[in-house]
């Protein structure tokens, strides 16, 4: 019985010229994975990874496709005529053979650009804002913490007792307060094997996912 | 078209080593990997190793680890096979052949050198 | 190691005879299999490959079908050229196997 599932990078979009990686990914299932077979919208044959053979690249693809990370396949140089569904299929024992599709979008890069000249300053424009409020909200927090501390002086200030001053530490450890958590730029071990340009590319895909992760900011707040 | 030419026969003997050459014309040949198959008198067909001539990087047959090595010269399109520590059972003919474009089967084959070993 | 075990190991035919050799690998290959064909003193020729694919300018006449563990060369109509050896390679693990050969001769 087949459980398992092939998950892959969906729809995807690159600039003409650019790169991009062609990713699924088998889960659910134990099945060893003997042979990833990659093929284009008309199933003319991409690439072929065996797992004791190694890659086979078709030949006409040589100079631009290249292998890897992992089981997935990196597209360099990419066209117009790019466009279209990508397969990619898992031939794995005992399970049997699991099919996976891409559908990739290649851009012209005036459209690619001009989609990004009003993407970044709207992005830099929410950090901001981001930014903004995270201050806010630690500004709010600070005053409300020296009222109720005044408060508690004024009530005890006959009893001549120092404040400890414990509340207003801040805590150094995971990181200061309102700081908003990048993710990694690239996640570790990724491209331990994998130099020059795939790398690079790799490095720029998880850039962007880390500029997109800017809006999770952490909270120190006191619970109780 | 394509065609893959063969160093001439060659005779050697046992514990010596012997280095066939197979030139490439009528491609582009760091597009394909490069075979090497061997046929002894009267036998069948014995794989030993395929390189890739783009990237240089080579896969051996299990017995042949440690016997074969396989070597490209992208300049002058010719592919090189290396066999140490010849035994009077390494005599045989020994082929050249093109990769396919579609996994690792034969495409085009050269004509073929036999290695004798005899003392 | 993926043994392909051909047969038959030889058979005798006519000009115009219908010819069909098997190979069985011993294990699910699913359709990574090729099929050569030699003459005596000659490199080998491929003439099939992914089980059913003919190179350009192989005859119509050779076919190939199979998957999985079952695989045929039939040559519908045998032509004087085709007597030689036929072998089957698979192409989907380390090592490479080759068939031990059919060798079609003149009856």
């Known amino acids: 019985m087949m459980t398992g599932t092939i998950e892959t990078t969906g729809n995807i979009s690159a600039k003409k010229g650019g790169s991009v990686i062609l990713q699924c990914h088998l889960s659910s299932t134990m099945a060893q994975v003997t042979q990833v077979n990659w093929e284009q919208h008309d199933h003319s044959l991409l690439a072929i990874r065996n797992a004791e053979l190694g890659w086979h690249i078709y030949p006409a693809f040589k100079d631009r496709v290249a292998p890897g990370p992992g089981l997935g396949l990196t597209l360099q140089s990419l066209t117009m005529n790019d466009t279209g569904e990508y397969f990619c299929t898992y031939h794995t024992y005992p399970d049997g053979t699991y099919r996976g599709r891409i559908f990739l979008e290649v851009l012209e890069s005036s459209v690619a650009e001009h989609s990004a000249r009003f993407q970044i300053p709207l992005l830099g424009a929410m950090a901001m804002m981001l930014v903004v409020i995270c201050i806010a909200v630690i500004v709010v927090v600070v005053l409300a913490r020296k009222k109720k501390s005044l408060r508690i002086h004024s009530v005890e200030s006959g009893l001549q007792r120092k404040s400890t001053g414990q509340e207003e530490q801040i805590p150094s450890a995971p990181s200061p307060p309102g700081s908003c958590v990048q993710a990694e730029a690239a996640p570790a071990g990724l491209c331990g094997e994998q130099q020059g340009d795939d790398c690079a590319e790799l490095h720029d895909y998880f850039n962007v996912l880390s500029y997109r992760s800017l809006g999770s900011c952490s909270f120190f707040t006191e619970t109780g | 078209q394509v065609q893959l030419v063969q160093s001439g026969a060659e005779v050697k003997k046992p514990g010596a080593s012997v280095k066939v050459s197979c030139k490439a014309s009528?491609?582009?040949?760091?597009?394909?990997?490069m075979y090497w198959v061997r046929q002894a008198p009267g036998q069948g067909l014995e794989w030993i190793a395929f390189?890739?001539?783009?990237?240089?990087?080579?896969t051996y047959a299990q017995k042949f680890q440690g016997k074969a090595t396989l070597t490209v010269d992208t300049s002058i399109s010719t592919a090189y096979m290396e066999l140490s520590r010849l035994r009077s059972d390494d005599t045989a003919v020994y082929y050249c052949?093109?990769?396919?474009?579609?996994?690792?089967?034969?495409?085009?084959w050269g004509q073929g050198t036999l290695v004798t070993v005899s003392s | 190691d993926i043994q392909m075990t051909q047969s038959p190991s030889s058979l005798s035919a006519s000009v115009g005879d219908r010819v069909t050799i098997t190979c069985r690998p011993s294990?699910?290959?699913?359709?990574?299999l090729s099929w050569y064909q030699q003459k005596p003193g000659k490199a080998p020729k491929l003439l099939i490959y992914?089980?059913?694919s003919l190179p350009s300018g192989v005859p119509s006449r050779f076919s190939g079908s199979g998957s999985g563990t079952d695989f045929t060369l039939t040559i519908s109509s045998l032509q004087p050229e085709d007597f030689a050896t036929y072998y089957c390679?698979?192409?989907?693990?380390?090592?490479?196997?080759f068939g031990q050969g059919t060798k079609v001769e003149i009856k």
């Open positions: 052949a093109r990769g396919g474009d579609y996994g690792w089967y034969l495409g085009v």
């Open positions: 992914n089980a059913k």
């Open positions: 390679q698979h192409h989907y693990g380390n090592p490479l196997t």
């Open positions: 294990e699910n290959i699913y359709t990574y």
């Open positions: 009528g491609y582009t040949f760091t597009r394909y990997s």
């Open positions: 390189i890739d001539a783009y990237s240089g990087g080579s």
